[in-house]
Interface confidence: medium
């Protein structure tokens, strides 16, 4: 039997032959950031180069006596983890070690910047194939370790980090809070977040996915034979690390901005208990565990998207709130949420060339959450257009008048400090294809996308009676680009992402007196490419 | 994930510089913040990472480092340059005594000073 | 015991070619990176290109580009050099070595004379 | 290019005295600077990689220091065997090898 950490990342066609996915990631590069390693342990030996490179401080305590199986055993089973022969992700990928962290397993944002840049050196001189940089450590949030990162990410360097282990919100630490890393947080046998001590894995917004990482089997440093379990985000890390290198040598030509939707797409959803993270963590956290693609699978013909949140906005009454997309994603629609339902919505601007989303904090609101959704798309070309609030019965309406173009997203925005005094639209009408619809009071803000062979349609659901809760979801070869709630629903907190599914949320209906009048429902935009199906059927 | 906007400490000193003749001057107003680790016990004060401004030349990022030296030297510091960096972001590596930072911090180019902090295996 | 072993220096004509081999043995080849390097008669050290383990990416100095041609056979833990077009300038110990990343040259083989005369 | 002057081109000594031999680049290259040994007949041995770090197997006598652009190599006291060749050698973008033009330490 195989362990329980390859069986869960494994999918279920290759379980019939044991674990013998191909032998991946043989066109990739590993660099592993962290302590010296064994390099003739016999899980990685002839895999592994030591580099020349080494920056760690003095360890701490005058007493400290130096013991080679100790300085090495984290970084050793790490690299057993991502590459090991019998125990390894990716048996076929290479690694390259730099040590940035002493025997204690200490280290300093300086001395891995140097890393960092010693890296970035080595591709300049000598380049190689797609590189994945294996960040396995964490710190206080630091602005200049996350600068690196973006600059080594926008490179073309692939870079994987541990979420941490202090049961805490990964933003606050770095490199785990770039948004150009891929950050791992751990998850168990039995799909809960990994315990450690009083303590345990990170969570939040800041984490892209879960991995497995407790009792994790690799490489010992107690000899050249030996193994050992060990937990913690490192070793989810590890594995996400060696997923990439598999994904990047199946499909070389992949950009961070596609493996890290691959990686979303191809994880098992919404398996974690989220009771385990604080409750306002929970809508934040991805309900993600990494698993490897399919063997035969090329997913370049899929419309992929994924959710961003923001950070939070903070209480003031004119505070907002900014979700940005990845480099090479386009922003197909902008929602907003707030716990106390106090926001003045959202809308998408344009900064620094790039389309962001911004929610508004209202009065008396506790703080905002800007939500983008972030999609893949060839040759797309995307506009917003706006209606001002129509003070009309009918409600303020827009669409996609441009020839070509359709509609991936709405949003609604409003000066107004509460909408619920507002009266609602006496009539809402039905959904159509190219236009969004909204209260009267707000301004609409359509999003209308161009791309070779894209196609959408609007989906609602409507419930008669208040919900706190209101889901509608695409079918299978569409992909939900916009989640937005029907006007009218004047008690909503608002509407978000989780993979495929659009979910509106509402205030509690049993503490706002509301009536079957103010019924909630969820509009989702599905959207596909014809264009991208199409090659992918000349391909097979 | 998270933008420039963490739970750090942030001192921004809006500060020009007090040398005359300095052709390279930044402009009036012109802001370079300081930026520390919340984690107390994670600093390490003493050492900094001194950030230039993106488009700023890689000879830029010796020449800046050898100012502050020698205006240090001036006050009767010492400092060291630890490393130059050139293939990520233009800057430097400095051990010194906080007291200059303010020094630091006027000096053309410069875009932000982040002390030294810990970091850990996860 | 890290070793290597060059061979197939000797007398060459001008104009002719020849193809150095160095045989590693010690550790596994296919994971290390190699390089060559050159030494004329009472001169210093010249270096002339490598080949990267990852994959298999060779690099040169702009002096030898066309000249010279480094590949490598991992099922016989062998490195080999190709010479074209050899002068009397050419005439030189020549030296395969392994290098880390961090581009220090930890190990050398004992070097082979090539002799370019008529 | 870099290029990697050393300096002396000769340093005459007797055994037991200090030798320092010193390597400039002439652009900014960190730390990333090794130095070699060479004695007649023989390939070059690594004695220090990242301008400090000792070779594996390479006595203490043998010390590097400096970064950026100025590195020395110290042999604190000479013993008979180290009379030889050494060069600097340094890698950067283009081209990524380097070696300096050598210092000869030889007996006074």
């Known amino acids: 039997s195989i362990p329980w950490n390859l069986e869960r990342i494994t999918p279920a066609r290759y379980r019939a032959d044991e674990y013998q996915p191909p032998k991946g990631g043989s066109l990739v590069e590993v660099y592993l950031l962290d302590t010296s390693i064994q390099s003739d342990h016999r899980e990685i030996e002839g895999r592994v180069m030591v580099t020349d490179f080494e920056s760690v401080p003095e360890e701490d305590g005058t007493r400290f006596h130096r013991q080679a199986s100790k300085c090495d055993s984290h970084g050793t089973h790490l690299a057993g983890v991502v590459s090991g022969r019998d125990a390894g992700v990716a048996k076929g990928a290479g690694l390259r070690s730099l040590r940035v962290l002493n025997c204690q397993g200490k280290g300093t944002v300086s001395g891995t910047l140097i890393g960092l840049e010693f890296i970035r050196k080595s591709q300049l001189v000598q380049p190689v194939g797609p590189l994945v940089v294996l960040l396995p450590l964490a710190g206080g949030y630091s602005r200049v370790f996350n600068a690196a990162c973006q600059r080594l990410a926008r490179a073309g360097v692939v870079l994987v980090t541990a979420a941490g282990n202090f049961r805490d919100d990964a933003c606050l630490y770095s490199p785990a809070s770039a948004p150009e890393v891929i950050t791992v947080g751990a998850t168990n046998a039995q799909d809960q977040p990994v315990t450690l001590g009083t303590l345990g894995t990170n969570f939040g917004r800041c984490v892209d996915l879960f991995a497995p990482g407790e009792d994790i089997i690799g490489a010992s440093s107690d000899c050249s034979t030996c193994f050992v379990s060990r937990s913690g985000t490192s070793q989810a890390a590890a594995h996400v690390a060696g997923i990439a290198a598999m994904m990047l040598s199946a499909e070389p030509e992949l950009t961070l901005a596609e493996l890290r939707q691959r990686l979303i797409h191809f994880s098992a959803k919404d398996v974690i208990n989220e009771a385990w993270f604080p409750e306002d963590q929970r809508v934040l956290t991805p309900n993600l565990v990494a698993a490897l693609p399919p063997s035969t699978h090329r997913a370049g013909w899929q419309l992929f998207c994924r959710t961003v949140w923001s950070a939070h906005s903070g209480p003031t009454r004119m505070a907002t709130a900014v979700a940005r997309c990845a480099q090479d994603e386009e922003l197909l629609s902008c929602s907003s949420f707030s716990r106390s339902g106090k926001r003045r919505g959202e809308r998408i601007e344009a900064q620094g060339g790039k389309r962001v989303c911004r929610a508004h904090n209202a009065f008396g609101g506790e703080g905002v959450y800007a939500i983008a959704r972030c999609c893949l798309l060839p040759q797309v070309n995307c506009s917003v257009h706006t209606a001002p609030p129509a003070g009309a019965s009918m409600g303020t309406r827009v669409h996609c008048h441009q020839q070509g173009h359709v509609l991936t997203g709405c949003s609604s925005h409003w000066e107004v400090e509460d909408l619920g005094t507002h009266k609602p639209p006496v009539l809402r009408p039905r959904g159509q294809p190219n236009q969004c619809v909204g209260h009267r009071e707000a301004s609409i803000h359509a999003s209308c996308c161009h791309a070779p062979g894209l196609e959408c349609k609007v989906k609602e659901h409507g419930i008669p009676a208040p919900q706190e809760q209101v889901i509608v979801a695409c079918e299978d070869g569409w992909t939900l680009t916009g989640c937005s709630p029907l006007p009218g629903t004047s008690h909503v907190l608002g509407a978000y992402a989780v993979d495929n599914t659009c979910v509106v949320r509402s205030r509690d209906v049993s503490t706002t007196g509301s009536t079957s009048k103010e019924a909630v429902a969820a509009v989702a935009i599905c959207c596909r490419s014809r264009h991208l199906v199409q090659a992918s059927q000349e391909l097979q | 994930q998270e933008d420039e906007d963490g739970d750090y400490e942030e001192l921004v000193l809006a500060l020009r510089s007090e040398e005359d003749g300095l052709a390279d001057a930044p402009e009036h107003g012109a802001t370079a913040t300081f930026h520390r680790c919340a984690k107390d016990p994670w600093r390490l004060p003493g050492t900094y990472v001194v950030v230039l401004k993106e488009e700023t030349h890689r000879s830029q990022s010796e020449r800046t480092a050898r100012r502050l030296q020698a205006q240090a030297a001036r006050r009767g510091y010492l400092t060291k340059i630890l490393h130059v960096f050139h293939h990520l972001l233009p800057g430097f590596l400095v051990k010194m005594s906080g007291d200059l930072l303010e020094l630091a911090l006027k000096l053309p180019h410069v875009d932000y000073i982040e002390e030294d902090s810990s970091v850990f295996a996860q | 015991q890290v070793q290597l072993l060059e061979s197939g220096g000797g007398l060459v004509q001008p104009g002719g070619s020849l193809r150095l081999s160095c045989k590693a043995s010690g550790y596994t080849f296919s994971r290390q990176g190699f390089t060559w390097v050159r030494q004329a008669p009472g001169k210093g050290l010249e270096w002339i290109g490598w080949i990267d383990p990852g994959n298999g990416g060779t690099r040169y100095n702009e002096k030898f580009k066309g000249k010279a041609t480094i590949s490598r056979d991992n099922s016989k833990n062998t490195l080999y050099l190709q010479m074209n077009s050899l002068r009397a300038e050419d005439t030189a110990v020549y030296y395969c070595?392994?290098?880390?990343?961090?581009?220090?040259?930890?190990?050398w083989g004992q070097g082979t004379l090539v002799t370019v005369s008529s | 290019e870099i290029v990697l002057t050393q300096s002396p081109a000769t340093l005459s000594l007797s055994p037991g005295e200090r030798a320092t031999i010193t390597c400039r680049a002439s652009?900014?290259?960190?730390?990333?600077l090794n130095w070699y040994q060479q004695k007649p007949g023989q390939a070059p041995r690594l004695l220090i990689y990242?301008?400090?770090n000792r070779a594996t197997g390479i006595p203490a006598r043998f010390s590097g220091s400096g970064s950026g652009t100025d590195f020395t190599l110290t042999i604190s006291s000479l013993e008979p065997e180290d009379f030889a060749v050494y060069y600097c050698?340094?890698?950067?973008?283009?081209?990524?090898?380097?070696f300096g033009g050598g210092t000869k330490v030889e007996i006074k």
């Open positions: 070595a392994r290098y880390r990343v961090g581009y220090s040259l930890d190990y």
């Open positions: 050698q340094v890698w950067d973008s283009s081209p990524p090898v380097v």
């Open positions: 652009q900014y290259v960190g730390s990333y």
């Open positions: 990242d301008a400090s």
